[in-house]
């Protein structure tokens, strides 16, 4: 039975040219996390963290994505095209797969606030 829940940073906004932390947290389960996938709104994979081998950043994002903090992901040099949904997928044993959603809005305005509250989707 899957007892866990994914908490995410929910809906966040950040300035064009700036950076943002995408963060998910799996709680309420003792399941072992074997892999975490980070996926963009167009279903392209940004990065994967394998529990044994570590981070793989997909070549297309190598210059703009930094691993961490933790199992999260830092997206840098933001453009307006980065606006959209991001998904974290936790592969766990024995529970199976948990998925969280984050919506990122990239703003032109210099007064854009970067909120980083945790929400349960």
């Amino acid at each position: 039975m899957m007892t866990g829940t994914i908490e995410t940073t929910g809906n966040i906004s950040a300035k064009k040219g700036g950076s943002v932390i995408l963060q998910c947290h799996l709680s309420s389960t003792m399941a072992q996390v074997t892999q975490v996938n980070w996926e963009q709104h167009d279903h392209s994979l940004l990065a994967i963290r394998n529990a044994e081998l570590g981070w793989h950043i997909y070549p297309a994002f190598k210059d703009r994505v930094a691993p961490g903090p933790g199992l999260g992901l830092t997206l840098q040099s933001l453009t307006m095209n980065d606006t959209g949904e991001y998904f974290c997928t936790y592969h766990t044993y024995p529970d199976g797969t948990y998925r969280g959603r984050i919506f990122l809005e990239v703003l032109e305005s210099s007064v854009a606030e970067h909120s980083a509250r945790f929400q349960i989707p």
Epitope: Q35, E52, H56
Partner: antibody, heavy 128, light 108 residues
Framework: EVQLVESGGGLVQPGGSLRLSCAAS????????MDWVRQAPGKGLEWVGR??????????EYAASVKGRFTISRDDSKNSLYLQMNSLKTEDTAVYYC???????????????????WGQGTTVTVSS | EIVLTQSPGTLSLSPGERATLSCRAS???????LAWYQQKPGQAPRLLIY???SRATGIPDRFSGSGSGTDFTLTISRLEPEDFAVYYC?????????FGGGTKVEIK
């Protein structure tokens, strides 16, 4: 041309130390995991350890047989990999190879790890 | 750690014959982390197969790999004189990375 060249092998007494080097060329060294593998005379291959890439903060991992005695390090500015071997034992006698680790995922999030480029090896003999 | 057992230890065959090499894992391993290497005397190992079935760059199509779970196979469809060597399987996940003991393919 993608190439790995080991150096630093030699004869050392039990309890002694030795530092092996591996010079890499022809590829972006900082992007890659790097492994050390050894082969005792007339025996099979044995994995010694690895250093991960820059994205993984160059973290290291070791085989149980060498943990606490061997240290793997790298200098990306020199495209070089190192293996510091301390408290050497006669059973450490072997040819030591450095190898490039290919760690990646395909579009289907299927992961791979293998060693696709190997050096020619350097011989370490531990004997009194 | 996962123990890889290769069989047979030695395979005596003639050029032109088919070689079938086995690699058995002590517990299930992901096929994507299973590789095969060839080693000739006095030389470094050479990658043949990765992901259990994908040929490395420059490897002739007479070499093929298959298998999943605990049983993997390397097949050489028609042995060429340069194929007589020692072959090793290797797995990378779970850690630590381990090699099989090797199979020597020798001329009969």
């Amino acid at each position: 041309e993608v190439q790995l060249v080991e150096s630093g092998g030699g004869l050392v007494q039990p309890g002694g130390s030795l530092r092996l080097s591996c010079a890499a060329s022809g590829f972006t060294f900082s992007d890659h995991y790097m492994d050390w593998v050894r082969q005792a005379p007339g025996k099979g291959l044995e994995w010694v350890g690895r250093t991960r890439n820059k994205a993984n903060s160059y973290t290291t991992e070791y085989a149980a047989s060498v943990k606490g005695r061997f240290t793997i390090s790298r200098d990306d500015s020199k495209n070089s990999l190192y293996l510091q071997m301390n408290s050497l034992k006669t059973e450490d006698t072997a040819v030591y190879y450095c190898a490039r680790g290919q760690y990646y995922y395909g579009s289907s999030s299927r992961g791979y790890y293998y060693m696709d480029v190997w050096g020619q090896g350097t011989t370490v003999t531990v004997s009194s | 750690e996962i123990v890889l057992t290769q069989s047979p230890g030695t395979l005596s065959l003639s050029p032109g014959e088919r070689a079938t090499l086995s690699c058995r894992a002590s517990q299930s391993v992901s096929s994507s982390y299973l590789a095969w290497y060839q080693q000739k005397p006095g030389q470094a190992p050479r990658l043949l197969i990765y992901g259990a079935s994908s040929r490395a760059t420059g490897i002739p199509d007479r070499f093929s790999g298959s298998g999943s779970g605990t049983d993997f196979t390397l097949t050489i469809s028609r042995l060429e004189p340069e194929d007589f060597a020692v072959y090793y399987c290797q797995q990378a996940v779970p850690s630590p990375l381990t090699f099989g003991g090797g199979t020597k393919v020798e001329i009969k």
